[in-house]
């Protein structure tokens, strides 16, 4: 029952003497395992026997037995899917029908198989794409109907005989769908691939060549082109013909049009594979090239510089960069169109030629004021001299020069007039647009450049002012030289160091803190009376009259100022000490009475003592002494002593009476 | 060994047309270009043209290109150079040609005489 | 396409003296994948096909005498042969065949 047997197997293998085959197959009997195999090398069918007849290459029986080719030949199946065969090595005879001739328990099965075995390795087969184009990547493959595990073999690429540097890739196939190896090569033309010769060559494991397949490649491109020019230089006189020829070094498929470009625009009515200029101006100067086309696209030729030419056109001049700063940098250039470019140059400033200046350019490394002006050029190439041109203005731009300020007022200055300032300069670019003026003040400007100063100050000393356009510049600061009274004037004691005491020598010092002008007189007054004209006063020997309110004045010729009253304070011990009685010296006993001890201090007594006439201290401190009620036995002289931090004094004696009452004399 | 064996001599009148054939031996047909070349008596060699038997694609000198035709018989290995409308100056011998990577090969040359 | 302009037309020397022919190319004839110049020299006999004597600018075909020799790159080639021998009449083709194929006009060998 055929439905029974079913085989995948290639329908037919190739392979060459000496090498190998390996037949990938796969089978199913539905009715039970394989009990045999037997491989037979074109079998026919005897109908008498009804069996096959034909060289066994392989049996496989249930006694065992295998002849000696199955060492070459080798089932490398089983009993119920696979029935791989490997042929090993394989000969020219092999070619033919191989038969697998399967039995299972019930059923019989003859499958065929084809070999196709060469006497030399047989060449693999380039497939190209149908169009191959310049810079378009495409793929060759490279394809050998042959895999063998036994084997081994390489397909390489070579170009005109070169391996080709770019990497393949390779692949094998053994299946019982197909057996085959194949490169694949990814690569991107150039036209002049165009016409080489690219062969795949198979190779033996060792690299050792079998056989090859050659293709010439037909690379598609746009034509590639030689551009000719007569004069070869392309430098022509204005008036002179030019040639130029277009050369097509390649092109596939065929041109079809030629044109001729300048500057990158076509040029009309010259389609022709030469260009005739003739009687050529400057104008024409310019890139050349000419165009042809097919229908892969344009291709350009290499552009050819024509260059024409002729003597410098007048000539301008480019500053860089104006207006200038002073002391910047400046350059001007000269431009004048001439072919060939100017070989020298020259410069004129207002006018006026610039000595050795030959250059195109002109640097002034540090632009000064006297640097303005017209600047212009001319130009002069191998042709002849160009005309100068209008020329080109340098503004050269710098603060206010030379600034001073300058007092309008006569002089001298005194405190409290009305001063007035102008602010000077000798020039300036731009324009002076505002003043400053140090130091600042609540002053005014009744116009620009001039400052108002209203009662000035004795202390006001210098004044500067800036003249401003983009920068301001400082004048030297100007001195006012204010005159004014003597300052700060006041008394100020030299010695002693530490306090007066009566009997010291005394310095007083009339100080003040500034004057001008410097030359002074003083004056020394107490309680309004003038006591010396020297800056000191003197006291050999000071008294206490001496104390008091003193005063000194210092006069200029602006004026004079006093000082603030300065006390003179003597410290002395207590003097002029005297016992005072009230109601008097004569007191009636049981009344009261009271002693005062009177001095003349300075500082004032701080501590009193109290005497009788037997100059014994009474228990009394106080600057009174009271008695009450006073006796009798009171009676007698009394004096006192008084204390300060300077010394003691003391009192001549002073007698109290005391006499008795009528009550008293009437008891008695 | 490669061969090239060219069709033999023919004469020709002015305004006829001629088909030069070219049969190659020795290697796969297919791989390479055939071109052909001429030679008029006593001048330099001129290429007409190519045939590119894989695809037939041909490439024709421009001074050529109006009144050549080459064409190919993989089957035959043949390649075939028709050339119309015949003048005196086309008296030349034709050869077909073909390159290597390292050499070329000629075919004998076929002499042909355009005369009234 | 590809001019080739030989020099000398024509040029005739004893047996056994060196000379030398030059073949200029309007254009490069060197490819960049190999860095071979694609110029030929042939040498054709009257009534025969030419036969190729050197291919790349400088490889001499097999079986063809050292005497001859091939040498120069981009545009510029010559050919020199070193003794000349009798046998050795005969017109001398520069061949490019590095686009198309273009011939030069051809430089005559002949002996005094």
């Known amino acids: 029952d055929s439905s029974k047997w079913v085989f995948e197997h290639p329908e037919t293998l190739y392979a060459w003497e000496g090498a190998c085959v390996w037949i990938p197959c796969t089978y199913r009997a539905l009715d039970g395992d394989l009990e045999s195999f037997i491989l037979f090398h074109n079998p026919e069918y005897n109908k008498n026997t009804s069996k096959f007849d034909g060289t066994r290459l392989y049996e496989s029986t249930k006694d065992g037995k295998v002849p000696s080719e199955q060492k070459r030949v080798q089932f490398l199946g089983d009993k119920n899917k696979n029935c791989t065969l490997s042929i090993h090595p394989v000969h020219l005879n092999d070619s033919g029908q191989l038969g697998l001739r399967m039995e299972s328990k019930t059923e019989k099965w003859m499958e065929r198989i084809h070999l196709n075995v060469s006497e030399r390795p047989f060449p693999p087969h380039i497939q190209l794409p149908p169009e191959i184009q310049e810079s378009q990547e495409v793929t060759l493959t490279c394809l050998l109907n042959f895999s063998c595990y036994g084997y081994p073999i390489q397909l390489q690429w070579l170009l005109e005989g070169v391996p080709m540097r770019q990497a393949a890739v390779t692949s094998t196939s053994l299946t019982i769908k197909s057996v085959f190896t194949r490169s694949e090569l990814k690569f991107s033309p150039q036209w002049s691939h165009h016409g080489k010769i690219v062969t795949c060559q198979l190779q033996d494991a060792d690299g050792k060549f079998l056989s090859n397949d050659t293709v010439q490649l037909n690379v598609k491109h746009t034509p590639k082109l030689e551009i000719k020019v007569t004069p070869s230089d392309a430098i022509v006189r204005e008036g002179d013909s030019v040639t130029m020829t277009c050369e097509v070094s390649s092109s596939n498929p065929e041109y079809t049009t030629v044109s001729w470009l300048k500057d990158g625009t076509s040029l009309k009515k010259q389609n022709t594979f030469t260009l005739n200029l003739r009687e050529v101006t400057k104008d024409q100067s310019g890139k050349y090239c000419c165009q042809v086309s097919n229908d892969v696209g344009p291709g350009r030729s290499e552009e050819v510089f024509l260059q024409v030419q002729y003597a410098p056109e007048p000539s301008t001049v480019q500053i860089l960069h104006s207006p200038a700063v002073e002391g910047s940098q400046v350059e001007f250039l000269c431009m004048s169109l001439a072919n060939p470019l100017p070989t020298n140059y020259t410069w004129y400033h207002n006018g006026k030629e610039m000595q050795g200046r030959t250059e195109e350019k002109v640097h002034i490394p540090k632009i000064l004021p006297w640097h303005a002006g017209t600047y212009s050029c001319v130009a002069e190439n191998i042709l002849g001299t160009g005309q100068r041109g209008p020329g080109a203005e340098l503004d050269v731009q710098y603060p206010p020069k030379k600034v001073t300020t300058v007092i309008q007022n006569p002089m001298p200055i005194r405190e409290g007039d009305t001063v007035t300032l102008s602010c000077n300069y000798n020039s300036s670019n731009p324009s002076v647009t505002r003043y400053e003026w140090k130091p600042h003040g609540a002053w005014e400007e009744p116009s620009l450049g001039v400052l108002k100063i209203q009662n000035v100050g004795w202390d006001n000393t210098t004044i500067a002012c800036a003249a401003c356009n983009s920068w301001c510049s400082w004048a030297s600061p100007v001195a006012l030289n204010v005159q004014y009274a003597p300052r700060d004037v006041r008394v100020r004691k030299i010695k002693p160091l530490s306090e007066i005491h009566s009997g010291n020598s005394v310095s007083l010092q009339c100080d003040f803190s500034s004057s001008h002008p410097k030359e002074v007189q003083f004056f020394w007054e107490k309680n309004g009376r003038l006591l010396g004209k020297e800056s000191q006063l003197n006291f050999d020997s000071i008294s206490p009259e001496d104390a008091g309110s003193y005063s000194c004045w210092v006069n200029n010729s602006i004026g004079q100022t006093a000082s603030k009253a300065w006390t003179l304070e003597v410290l002395y011990a207590p003097r002029r000490l005297r016992v005072s009685m009230s109601p008097g010296d004569q007191v009636m006993e049981g009344k009261s009475a009271t002693l005062t001890c009177e001095s003349d201090a300075n500082p004032p007594v701080s501590h009193y003592t109290w005497f009788d006439w037997n100059n014994q201290s009474l228990p009394y401190h106080s600057q009174k002494l009271r008695l009450e009620p006073v006796k009798v036995q009171h009676s007698g002289a009394y004096w006192c002593q008084g204390t300060n931090s300077v010394g003691k004094g003391r009192s001549p004696l002073s007698t109290l009476t005391v006499y008795y009452s009528p009550e008293t004399i009437g008891r008695r | 060994q490669v061969q090239l064996v060219q069709s033999g001599a023919e004469v020709k009148k002015p305004g006829a047309s001629v088909k030069v054939s070219c049969k190659a031996s020795g290697y796969t047909f297919t791989s390479y270009w055939l071109h052909w070349v001429r030679q008029a008596p006593g001048q330099r060699l001129e290429w007409i043209g190519y045939i590119n038997p894989r695809n037939d694609y041909t490439e024709y000198n421009q001074n050529f290109k109006d009144r050549v035709t080459i064409t190919a018989d993989t089957s035959a290995s043949t390649a075939y150079m028709e050339l119309s409308s015949l003048r005196s100056e086309d008296t030349a011998v034709y050869y077909c040609?073909?390159?290597?990577?390292?050499?070329?090969?000629w075919g004998q040359g076929t002499t042909l005489t355009v005369s009234s | 396409d590809i001019v080739l302009t030989q020099s000398p037309d024509s040029l005739a020397v004893s047996a056994g003296e060196r000379v030398t022919m030059n073949c200029k190319s309007s254009q490069s004839v060197l490819y960049s994948a190999n860095h071979k110049n694609y110029l030929a020299w042939y040498q054709q006999k009257p009534g025969q096909p030419p036969k190729l004597l050197i291919y790349w600018a400088s490889t001499r075909e097999s079986g063809v005498p050292d005497r001859f020799s091939g040498s120069g790159s981009g545009t510029d080639f010559t050919l020199t042969i070193s003794s000349v021998q009798a046998e050795d009449v005969a017109i001398y083709y520069c061949?490019?065949?590095?686009?198309?194929?273009?011939f030069g006009g051809g430089t005559k060998l002949e002996i005094k």
């Open positions: 061949h490019q065949y590095l686009s198309s194929w273009t």
């Open positions: 040609a073909r390159r290597d990577i390292t050499t070329f090969y």
